[in-house]
């Protein structure tokens, strides 16, 4: 413990105390504040200034202050969080959500509750990526595009364009080519087979899938349909 090295003084009538000083109502004097990392151990009197002391472990003060006790640091970060700022005598611990998660319930500093980012399912791609404070939004893959993954980052990708279509693509599956040179690179003479994927996803009942190849249809679940003509709001 040490005293701050100057004596309290009475302010001029109608005047204010200087920077890093406060007016003590009991002593009716301008007294020193304690610096960040310390707190007021003994308040000032008419003849002695504030006595400051260091914050104890797991407590802190971030500002110049005259609080009798330092503030407690927040509890340890939960398993879905990472500590981005440690608890020191001058700053509180800050917990932020770990990668793949976002803050569903924030607090003054850091996050109170993290939630896992939504993953878009086959047939849907990311329309709006997740941020520190907002979840992923998914959208149906438009005709001519697909997504065959469950992912919080994958967008809908164009179907490969085939010279000869073996199986037309749909919202959750790429087109399958029999030609030797589809528009996306692959080994000469190979038949491109998309990754196997469950066709179950948020789709309408099976109807002919949209295809880049004219005159072909293939019964598989496909993306949702726009409203009937005449609906408002477009």
């Amino acid at each position: 413990p040490r005293a701050v090295a100057f004596t309290p003084y009475a302010p001029e009538p109608g005047g204010t105390c200087r920077l890093r000083e406060y007016y003590d109502q009991t002593a009716q004097m301008c007294c020193s504040k304690c610096p960040p990392g310390q707190h007021a151990k003994v308040f000032c009197t008419k003849t002695s200034d504030t006595v400051c002391d260091s914050c104890e472990d797991s407590t802190y003060t971030q500002l110049w202050n005259w609080v009798p006790e330092c503030l407690s640091c927040g509890s340890r970060c939960s398993s879905d969080q990472v500590e981005t700022q440690a608890c020191t005598r001058e700053q509180n611990r800050i917990c932020t959500c770990r990668p793949g998660w976002y803050c569903a319930l924030s607090k003054q500093e850091g996050c109170r509750l993290c939630a896992q980012l939504r993953k878009c399912r086959p047939g849907f791609g990311v329309a709006r990526p997740g941020t520190e404070t907002s979840d992923v939004v998914c959208k149906p893959c438009a005709p001519g595009t697909f997504s065959n993954t469950t992912s919080s980052t994958d967008i809908c990708r164009p179907h490969q364009i085939c010279h000869v279509v073996a199986i037309p693509g749909n919202a959750s599956m790429d087109a399958v080519c029999t030609s030797t040179s589809p528009t996306r690179s692959m080994a000469p003479g190979a038949v491109h087979l998309p990754q196997p994927v469950s066709t179950r996803s948020q789709h309408t009942q099976p109807t002919p899938a949209p295809s880049t190849a004219p005159g072909t249809s293939f019964l598989l679940p496909v993306g949702p349909s726009p409203p009937a003509e005449g609906s408002t709001g477009d």
């Epitope: 939630a115 896992q116 939504r118 993953k119 878009c120 399912r121 047939g123 849907f124 329309a127 709006r128 979840d135 992923v136 939004v137 998914c138 959208k139 149906p140 469950t150 179950r200 996803s201 948020q202 789709h203 309408t204 009942q205 679940p221 993306g223 949702p224 349909s225 726009p226 409203p227 009937a228 609906s231 709001g233 477009d234």
Partner: antibody, heavy 125, light 107 residues
Framework: QVQLQQSGPGLVKPSQTLSLTCAIS??????????WNWIRQSPSRGLEWLGR?????????DYALSVKSRITINPETSKNQFSLQLNSVTPEDTAVYYC???????????????WGQGTLVTVSS | DIQMTQSPSSLSASVGDRVTITCQAS??????LNWYQQKPGKAPKLLIY???NLEIGVPSRFSGSGSGTDFTFTISSLQPEDIATYYC?????????FGQGTRLEIK
């Protein structure tokens, strides 16, 4: 806080059209992250999803196959509401009808998080 | 359509009891399952999403588990305000479907 306020008649004659409206406050019918659903509940069928409308750069509709030939769900952006029309009703369509907001269409974490107060619709002559 | 079968259809338990409801899907629905609570004259209320995630503000005595086709909903210590009907709901595929409900009463 999202709130859904339902309106519409409680009595409809057989073969006529059931029409209900759900007014949205605290969110937008054109929201790029929500979907707007109609669900009904009756003692015989329990909770039955009827369909939804949602906007992702364009409007989408999905309908239950059981009512697909008779149902229309339309967004009304100017009034921030959406409507249900069910044609050619029969007494079997008697139920409490709910509108509900769905968060997470097409992804994991897809659920109904806000519901209207429910409207009992009786189909009877 | 994917059928969701809940059991039991009704049950009676005492305050403080551990209560378990099961929900079986007619085909694999992965983890795409939610649980709702409905009190008389009210709309359903989301309790748990994606099998086991508690909605914000829902008491921790509610929990869920399972995957594939078999799922369980548990109230660890029944409270008087838990008297309601509970529904499971799948969103693996359209149409979205609900279980027939489990009515919970106090003994």
């Amino acid at each position: 806080q999202v709130q859904l306020q339902q309106s519409g008649p409680g009595l409809v004659k057989p073969s006529q059209t059931l029409s209900l409206t759900c007014a949205i406050s605290g969110d937008s019918v054109s929201s790029n992250s929500a979907a707007w659903n109609w669900i009904r509940q009756s003692p015989s069928r329990g909770l039955e999803w009827l369909g939804r409308t949602y906007y992702r750069s364009k409007w989408y509709n999905d309908y239950a196959l059981s009512v697909k030939s008779r149902i229309t769900i339309n967004p009304e952006t100017s009034k921030n509401q959406f409507s249900l029309q069910l044609n050619s009703v029969t007494p079997e369509d008697t139920a409490v009808y709910y509108c509900a907001r769905e968060d997470g269409v097409g992804g994991t974490k897809d659920y109904f998080d806000y519901w209207g107060q429910g409207t009992l619709v009786t189909v009877s002559s | 359509d994917i059928q969701m079968t809940q059991s039991p259809s009704s049950l009676s338990a005492s305050v403080g009891d551990r209560v378990t409801i099961t929900c079986q899907a007619s085909q694999d629905i992965d983890n795409y399952l939610n649980w709702y609570q409905q009190k008389p004259g009210k709309a359903p209320k989301l309790l748990i999403y994606d099998v086991s995630n508690l909605e914000i503000g829902v008491p921790s005595r509610f929990s869920g588990s399972g995957s594939g086709t078999d799922f369980t909903f548990t109230i660890s210590s029944l409270q008087p305000e838990d008297i309601a009907t509970y529904y499971c709901q799948q969103y693996d595929n359209l149409p979205l479907t609900f279980g027939q409900g489990t009515r919970l009463e106090i003994k």
